[in-house]
């Protein structure tokens, strides 16, 4: 197993309807044809595994299991969704990127995006 | 529901192993996130792993990570739980729980509606 680099943003704020995105890059060493993503929560003494998506570079990311994620790559770039968040999701989501083939496995772990959601206020009651 | 059933427990030496095993019978087991919790002795029930409906995604309270392995088989519907390097504060009654949910961040909070009668895991020096 050897070590890569995984850049990706500190704070992410998410939207009002409680989507958050954010890049993870990395610095991949070699021509990687097949590529794993697996976001990390790290809050709440857990560590959760949100999702996982493996993809050919080239192609769309394929996410395991009912994913609350989505997302699409170009280069060494993954774009990253978050859906259906609310203030409870608050917490550090880190982006583990690992190069499966062909050899050598590579692993990257990145520092950590600390996403943010505020739930909307509820639209005060209208005579209109 | 589902019913659930645990099985594995029993009295071990600090830094032994044991496997905890769940059965389910009933509904449909592969419609249900799988989660395994523990409670000693005038303590709360605390979350200790949970499973997606794939067997996919993991989820591990601190505590435990690195130490325990949940995983699942769906064809013969069961839920498991490797336990490693096992301390004196793992010892609690280990439930398994079964919710009726797709994944989300944070499985630990999961409408877990089906519950095992637990199984005992003592662990002494």
């Known amino acids: 197993c050897k070590a890569m680099h995984v850049a990706q943003p500190a704070v992410v704020l998410a939207s009002s309807r409680g989507i958050a995105s954010f890049v993870c890059e990395y610095a991949s060493p070699g021509k990687a044809t097949e590529v794993r993503v697996t976001v990390l929560r790290q809050a709440d003494s857990q560590v959760t595994e949100v999702c996982a998506a493996t993809y050919m570079m080239g192609n769309e990311l394929t996410f395991l299991d009912d994913s609350i994620c989505t997302g699409t790559s170009s280069g060494n770039q993954v774009n990253l969704t978050i859906q259906g968040l609310r203030a409870m999701d608050t917490g550090l989501y880190i982006c583990k990127v690992e190069l499966m083939y062909p050899p050598p496995y590579y692993l990257g772990i990145g520092n950590g995006t600390q996403i943010y959601v505020i739930d909307p206020e509820p639209c005060p009651d209208s005579d209109f | 529901e589902v019913q659930l059933m645990e099985s594995g427990g029993g009295l071990v030496q600090t830094g032994g192993s044991l496997r905890l095993s769940c059965v389910a019978s009933?509904?449909?087991?592969?419609?249900?996130?799988m989660g395994w919790f523990r409670q000693a002795p005038g303590k709360d029930r605390e979350f200790v792993a949970a499973?997606?409906?794939?067997?996919?995604?993991?989820s591990y309270a601190d505590s435990v990570k690195g130490r325990f392995t949940i995983s699942r088989d769906n064809a013969k519907k069961m839920a498991y739980l490797q336990m490693l390097f096992l301390k004196l504060e793992d010892s609690a009654v280990y439930y398994c729980?079964?919710?009726?949910?797709?994944?989300?961040?944070?499985?630990?909070?999961?409408?877990?509606?089906?519950w095992g009668q637990g199984t005992q895991v003592t662990v002494s020096s």
């Open positions: 729980a079964a919710a009726p949910v797709p994944w989300g961040t944070r499985p630990s909070t999961f409408p877990y509606d089906s």
């Open positions: 009933g509904r449909t087991f592969s419609n249900y996130t």
């Open positions: 499973i997606s409906r794939s067997g996919s995604l993991k």
